[in-house]
Amino acid sequence: ATKLTEEKYELKEGQTLDVKCDYTLEKFASSQKAWQIIRDGEMPKTLACTERPSKNSHPVQVGRIILEDYHDHGLLRVRMVNLQVEDSGLYQCVIYQPPKEPHMLFDRIRLVVTKGFSGTPGSNENSTQNVYKIPPTTTKALCPLYTSPRTVTQAPPKSTADVSTPDSEINLTNVTDIIRVPVFN
């Protein structure tokens, strides 16, 4: 069984979170994907999503978040640029598959953003000088309003969870508060 785990990223203000969520391409290549934040005691909120159906290697930008879905490679790339302290939180990638419930992809990301900037970025830390230029054709994708038929009685786990699943994606049943977000080019 695959455990529901999370990775802790410690970055400085102004840096870029640059991660990949891998999925079973045969099952989910063209499915709509989303990037969500899970705040303690709250339900996941969708911050950005790809188009439906998801387009191959086509950047979608929502504020400081850029999503790029590489169908051939079974990878969703997520970038959060110019990080702020208030961006700290638990994040996850999910796949929408209506009418089924969304699938969550491993691993969750626990982002901790601190003040100050380290002069020499680490191997995963892009500096503020890396301004991501997105083509003007960036899609204004709206995320679907998804309400789970089940009620959640507890907040998602904070650290490496004891939840075990037989597959690399799990059904996400605790999504009750998905927000629509504007897209900026």
């Epitope: 969520c21 079973t24 691993d107 990301i109 680490g122 191997s123």
Partner: antibody, heavy 124, light 107 residues
């Protein structure tokens, strides 16, 4: 000793398939993605795709889709790359390479550990 | 796909010389670039990652710089053991692509 040990050289006829193995030792096999890169004689390096040994997820370069299959056996810490419908232009040295990442899910594609390579010759 | 144009394809320099190799991407790759050294009969070796970070254990005479589409790899003082072919590799976009390589020889 941290290393990737690949299977020996192969000679194949056009239309046949080849399966190259890559055994990891000295580190936790399931903690790092394995990539495959090839190099035809006198040519540059060409990425073929990646595999997550933990979950078995894979991604292939479009050029090889339908012909390549990347698998693994976690019990023996071994990754495999099978290429079918071989043609003469597939004659190359095939490398497995470990993708190093400070964080498992970070968008980092640095290959810090390579196998010695497996020469695959396709000839009638 | 992002094309990587590496130049020169070969060069010959004297021991102690400063050697510079360039790689130009067909689109902005945001510093997502690595440099490898390959010696005959051996697997490639990572030297520089994310455009300018020196891999652990690699001599400080090797360095990398650049941004956007243009990147440079430098050997500040060429040594006999540096005879090899050098490749750049981008990961700003998938598929990952490599430059054509630069063969470095000593005069």
């Amino acid at each position: 000793q941290v290393q990737l040990v690949q299977s020996g050289a192969e000679v194949k006829k056009p239309g046949a398939s080849v399966k190259v193995s890559c055994k990891a030792s000295g580190y936790t096999f399931t903690s790092y993605d394995i990539n495959w890169v090839r190099q035809a004689t006198g040519q540059g390096l060409e990425w073929m795709g990646w595999m997550n040994p933990n979950r078995g997820n894979t991604g292939y370069v479009k050029k090889f889709q339908g012909r390549v299959t990347m698998t693994r056996n976690t019990s023996i810490s071994t990754a495999y790359m099978e290429l079918s419908s071989l043609r003469s232009e597939d004659t190359a040295v095939y490398y497995c390479a470990r993708r190093r990442a400070v964080y498992r899910s970070s968008w980092e594609w640095y290959f810090d550990l390579w196998g010695r390579g497996t020469l695959v010759t396709v000839s009638s | 796909d992002t094309q990587m144009t590496q130049s020169p394809s070969s060069l010959s320099a004297s021991e102690g010389d400063r050697v510079t190799i360039t790689c130009q991407a067909s689109q902005d790759i945001f510093n997502d670039l690595n440099w490898y050294q390959e010696k005959p009969g051996k697997a490639p070796k990572l030297l520089i990652y994310h455009a300018s970070n020196l891999e652990t254990g690699v001599p400080s005479r090797f360095s990398g710089s650049g941004s956007g589409t243009d990147y440079t790899f430098t050997i500040s003082s060429l040594q006999p053991e540096d005879i090899a072919t050098y490749y750049c590799q981008q990961y700003g976009n998938l598929p990952l692509t490599f430059g054509g390589g630069t063969k470095v020889e000593i005069k």
